[in-house]
Interface confidence: low
Amino acid sequence: IIPVEEENPDFWNRQAAEALGAAKKLQPIQTAAKNLIIFLGDGMGVSTVTAARILKGQKEEKLGPETPLAMDHFPYVALSKTYSVDKHVPDSAATATAYLCGVKGNFQTIGLSAAARYNQCNTTRGNEVVSVMNRAKKAGKSVGVVTTTRVQHASPAGAYAHTVNRNWYSDANMPGSARREGCKDIATQLISNMDIDVILGGGRKYMFRMGAPDPEYPHDYSQDGTRMDGKNLVQEWLAKHQGARYVWNRTELMQASLDPSVTHLMGLFEPGDMKYEIHRDPTLDPSLMEMTEAALRLLSRNPRGFFLFVEGGRIDHGHHESRAYRALTEAVMFDDAIERAGQLTSEEDTLTLVTADHSHVFSFGAYPLRGSSIFGLAPGKAQDRKAYTALLYGNGPGYVLKDGARPDVTESESGSPEYRQQAAVPLDEETHAGEDVAVFARGPQAHLVHGVQEQSFVAHVMAFAACLEPYTACDLAPPAGTTD
Amino acid sequence: IIPVEEENPDFWNRQAAEALGAAKKLQPIQTAAKNLIIFLGDGMGVSTVTAARILKGQKEEKLGPETPLAMDHFPYVALSKTYSVDKHVPDSAATATAYLCGVKGNFQTIGLSAAARYNQCNTTRGNEVVSVMNRAKKAGKSVGVVTTTRVQHASPAGAYAHTVNRNWYSDANMPGSARREGCKDIATQLISNMDIDVILGGGRKYMFRMGAPDPEYPHDYSQDGTRMDGKNLVQEWLAKHQGARYVWNRTELMQASLDPSVTHLMGLFEPGDMKYEIHRDPTLDPSLMEMTEAALRLLSRNPRGFFLFVEGGRIDHGHHESRAYRALTEAVMFDDAIERAGQLTSEEDTLTLVTADHSHVFSFGAYPLRGSSIFGLAPGKAQDRKAYTALLYGNGPGYVLKDGARPDVTESESGSPEYRQQAAVPLDEETHAGEDVAVFARGPQAHLVHGVQEQSFVAHVMAFAACLEPYTACDLAPPAGTTD
């Protein structure tokens, strides 16, 4: 499809002149930030951003790539180098330490410097690094964590936990030796390391004693509580604050978010990760956009401001499965949450960052016609005279041989939410990729997000913008609309 | 390898504090640009940038990803949307029209709006769009084109040509009907459309009559001249200017670039594309860095300034062959040219942009250890119990089945310059990819390069920065060090 208006050079010249005008008008907001929001698209490399843009554009009945995402409207962009201290291609644990604590760590460790060693409990103590969320709380701000994964997952855990093993969700996931040496599981750290005002996501089963039936799936033993210490961590957390409320479904979340007596809110909507957006039951589970809105409602009551971490955590899971449909629909939902947050906050006092922890070996190639489905086939056939998709993976479970040859694919197969795009190398799980990811920034001090930076720089921009440790002497005018 | 200094949080905190300090000091250069340089890495998507960074770092005996490329030092970054009017994933012709002329066009067409149709000569007239280089020449600046491909190739042709078919290198590549309708081959347009002061790259055979022996390969008929009109375009070009000089090897280039009587310089160093850097004979052919230096020497004599296009054009070719070794060594050489240009120019009066026309379905995955070779194997085995490489392609000639199965690979095989990384789908040629590419900017008005933009914006930033059409009323102070 060739849009007739785009045939005219004036279309492009006018559009560019407008973009230039906007660029010339762009003025850095030189005050401090009252609020900090970081949107983390787990696994959302640049190829995922572009493919999600096309999908979202086509959902709006446009051709696709011309239609900006919410994140595309952010005025400043930088590239972030994601390697961990020990690996060229990192995981979500080491990267969370970087962008949330400002220090790079080792693969599979969280909230610890690289002096800590994976799985070695005795290398924990003394190597903890403190997250910007923790520093924001110490400065009197309200803080929140929202994710579509379990709240004890690597990315959100970077905001509150210190562990040599990202898989220690509950004590049942830990070896006895580590427990005996005094290491704490992540669920325990969630409720005891610091005071978090809003906690929304999945992860119920790690909070309750082994065998405790799940409220949503009482007859499914695999969803039971997992804790071996017999504790009820939700109960313990509720006991800490008079205004604390625990919810486990969408209706309760909506009620709680509108209730002025609720000061602390924990919502755990699934035993493990939340469902993919395409499988979500909207009567039972909130969307990421709804969780974001609920969190902002509560947090924005604090006159000192807030820190909010919001993760589209299952973009990554879709890619690991070699299922681009899942990854991209998650990415579109993630962008919807960014859009909503933009409507509910002001760029005059809120620094909003959007970034990824790492990328995936996911590519969008061939030479598909403009307006064709992002999940569609490439024009023409491959050398083996079979069709192939525009979307492909470098490695992963999409690799299949049928009778010693690459399987053919039809347009209807390739458009299925279950379809796994083909890969060059067969792996149980498609891997992350090591290329730089984008950081999009808007609000006070967003102009500091520039050029090519280490991923750890992201945490420092947030800390500096809000005059948190170690930048309390930031020398910035107070945020818009505040009186000191 | 875990570098001991990186185990200390101070290492990262200090580094980030320095980066913040630099970001805070960053002041837009608000004057006009005297000179414009655009460095175009053909096919240099973000995954290629990161992999090249690791390769260059390791060549310098560092671990790799921590070591900045020359382009990494540029203060401003934007993302560029590369789709063409008719395709989600573009080619180098449509994209050249965008970043050099400021208007998006159709696949395989050059210097024409999207009202033109591929291969239809009669849709050319009236649809021409004018390049920034052409506008710079009209404003009295000197202009140059430097590339490692043939100078009539799609990317450089975007600076001077208008053609419905990028493959019309010489009249021998055109159908008779197109010639009869008055369409001109690209080599003819190179010498007749506009006055270009410096032309350096490959492409000798398109300039001489069919059967004319090549000076470097006189006994190889496949390298003979190709022109059917019997013309000697080099002779015609030399006749246009008293100070014009033609060279075809490195020694002659060096002499000419130091000769003050030379005002116009054409250097064509191969019959077709120049050799890959790893195959180059340094006694016969100049490197991209040397060509860039020679061009800058000549162009910078003009007190009104210059426009220079420099292309690392064979990054793209290495990827098309599924040979990452070639693509990445070309990318490192491209970065060396950027570094040299930075030493020879001042950011006070020169706007330098570095970008790509499009990406490739090239990924850098698995979880390789820090410091391991970029061409090395992934840790562990694939599901088929065979080794696999960290670098892989989505599609391309790297797809091979051996006895109905994926072939194994060793570390020594994967490190060979000839090795083709595996791909998910077998194609003669690996394809481009459609995700956004980075634009790096330094110098006057570089701060306008921000956020997510259409690729056509790139040309407008250059035109505006130098107060060229349509921005002659740019309202910018004159460039540093000039008197009006």
Partner: nanobody, 122 residues
């Protein structure tokens, strides 16, 4: 639904041996990783050993290393825990569990058996 049934527990003298079996029904064992856990009276459940279905990774808790061996017999859809040089502190209810490992989720055991008692007397 996947079901796991342990057997082979009993009373044994210190220094003796036992072989526990874990029969899996409802799904091919090759889809899962198998873990063995134990819980002594008044204590937390603790990890003993695990093996991935393809045999590529086996791990033992330090307290049983060199004495216990975990194995899988695909044909019978059964996993085994061979225990030798037993000590009184090995007395516990032993559970087998089936689950999957993924980098995104970590080690997770989705299905558990009801347990079999092992008592080691001095």
């Amino acid at each position: 639904q996947v079901q796991l049934v342990e057997s082979g527990g009993g009373l044994v003298q210190a220094g003796g041996s036992l072989r526990l079996s874990c029969a899996v029904s409802g799904r091919a064992l090759s889809d899962y990783n198998i873990g063995w856990f134990r819980q002594a009276p008044g204590k937390e459940r603790e990890f003993v050993a695990r093996k991935t279905w393809d045999g590529s990774s086996t791990r033992y808790d330090d307290s049983v290393k060199g004495r216990f061996t975990v194995s899988i017999e695909d044909a019978k859809n059964t996993a085994y825990l061979q225990m030798s040089s037993l000590k009184t502190e090995d007395t516990a209810v032993y559970y087998c569990a089936a689950g999957r490992y993924s980098r995104a989720r970590g080690w997770e055991y989705d299905y558990w058996g009801q347990g079999t008692q092992v008592t080691v007397s001095s």
